[in-house]
Each structure stands twice: as C-alpha cells, then as structure tokens.
Amino acid sequence: LVPHLGDREKRDSVCPQGKYIHPQNNSICCTKCHKGTYLYNDCPGPGQDTDCRECESGSFTASENHLRHCLSCSKCRKEMGQVEISSCTVDRDTVCGCRKNQYRHYWSENLFQCFNCSLCLNGTVHLSCQEKQNTVCTCHAGFFLRENECVSCSNCKKSLECTKLCLPQIENVKGTEDSGTT
C-alpha cells in the first residue's frame, strides 16, 4: 500500500530536500525559509532567493518552513501550576514545566497539570518521583494505598478494594490475640 500524502507533502516531495515547489509554477523549486523566519514571498524564478522575514515578537518557527505566518508562542498555564522554563524565541516555543518536587500529569497530548510528588508517609519510596510520573509508594503493614497515599487499614471499608490488602493484617492481629490467650 502506498501511504496517502497530503497536497503539501506531494508538492514538497517533487523538490529536493530543503526546497518546496512554487505554488503557482510547479516547475520551480524555491528554497525553504530557515527556522525563526517565515515565507513573505515565493522565489520569483529558479535559483532566485525566497523572500523570508524574521518572526515578530511573540511568534516563532522551530524548523525550516514555507509558512505564511509564524506560529504564536505558547503561554504557560498558571491555573495548571505551570511555570516558564525558557522564554519563547523566534526559533523556539516557550518551554513550560513544573516546580521542584512536582510532576506533570498529562490530561491530553497538549495539556498537563503540575502536582506535588507523594512523600510516601507510612510507606517507602519504591520509585522516585520523575518529570512525568509521581512517586511510587509501597505502604507499611497496616496501611493501604489510596490516591497514592498510605492510609491506615482502620479506614478500610468492606466494599473497597483495600479489603484484600488489609485482610492479612487483620487476620494477623486476630491470630496474635488468639495465641496470647492460651
């Protein structure tokens, strides 16, 4: 099967790398614009320069292109706890991240929220907190994991999954009491 190419990809594939086919004259290959610039005017003819202009403040292009407009710089989303790691430049978008001792949770491909890394109180750190993953905790005996926190088995209701985790502990307590009475 031949992969389906969009019109733009079809046009580009006719020209060598780093060039694109002139939209009005398919016998002309124009040089693409460098990152940090955008296409102002197509090249007038073969071997002639493409008119590329630098992106204005607040916009960028991160790779060679023949875009008619630069892309708008992203803004870090304060309501999601995001902080700016590096500012937008003409050839690189804003880089957003989280504060120290926080991790990113991606709600979708292009939306993340910052949350505090779990401290594993009443448990031990099985895997340390990573940029995109919370700490993985292992709970001490008598505790179970709920929403990545170690909660006392005394808070375990029969209907919850914790019964499986807390049952051995409960049985142990009963066993100890029974053996102590003989």
Epitope: K75, R77, K78, E79, M80, H105, W107, Q113, F115, N134, E147, N148
Partner: nanobody
C-alpha cells in the same frame, strides 16, 4: 457540601447546537478553575475544556476547538458550554468538574448530562 448539576443535554442532529449549563454550590465558585469533561460510550474520560476563575484564556481540546465555547457567570455560580457544529463523535455524557488539586483525579464532579448527535 460541593454540588454540581449539569443540564441542557439532549438529542440533536449533526451540525446542530446545544448549550450546557452547570449550576454550582457549596464552594466559592469565583475562585475555582472549572472543567468540562466527557465520556463517550465505551471510552475513557476526555478533557473537553476548562476556564480559569477570571474567565480569561480558556483551554479547548483540539477535537472541539473552533466549535465549542466555554464561559462562566460568577454572579450566578454557573458554568456553560456552547456547542456548535455538532458531530456524531461528540455523542457522550458531559460532566462539569472542579479542577483537581491534590492529584490527577476528580474529587468533585456532577452527575452528567447526555448529548446525542444523530440524524
């Protein structure tokens, strides 16, 4: 006690419009970022849109950008979702929720309102 009550769902033809509302109580609505999520039959939760407390710079999922508009009226403690140019793939139960704070789960969300897009 936090309460979120969605309304406005229903059956609509492709290309049609609906406006969902979410009445909030039990917390200071004007201080909270509010979220619309949806769940299509047999699918997981999908983040649709959210709006910060001041109503500025809302976020939209790529799948709804240019068709849906989120808004809020802090004086009425109400969140809205205007849905235009509806498609069959927008069929889902729509929930409003408070932006999570402690971790990546929803502590507070409504019972949902069903939107069915079909001819």
């Amino acid at each position: 006690e936090v309460q979120l009550l969605e309304s406005g769902g229903g059956l609509v033809q492709p290309g049609g419009s609906l406006r969902l509302s979410c009445a909030a109580s039990g917390f200071t609505f004007a201080h909270e970022t509010m979220v619309w999520v949806r769940q299509a039959p047999g699918r997981g939760l999908e983040w649709v849109s959210h709006i910060p407390s001041d109503g500025q710079d809302p976020f939209y999922a790529d799948s709804v950008k240019g068709r849906f508009t989120i808004s809020r009226d802090n004086s009425k403690n109400t969140l809205y979702l205007q849905m235009n140019s509806l498609r069959a793939e927008d069929t889902a139960v729509y929930y409003c929720a408070l932006l999570p704070k402690r971790g990546p789960w929803f502590d507070y969300w409504g019972q949902g309102t069903l939107v069915t897009v079909s001819s």
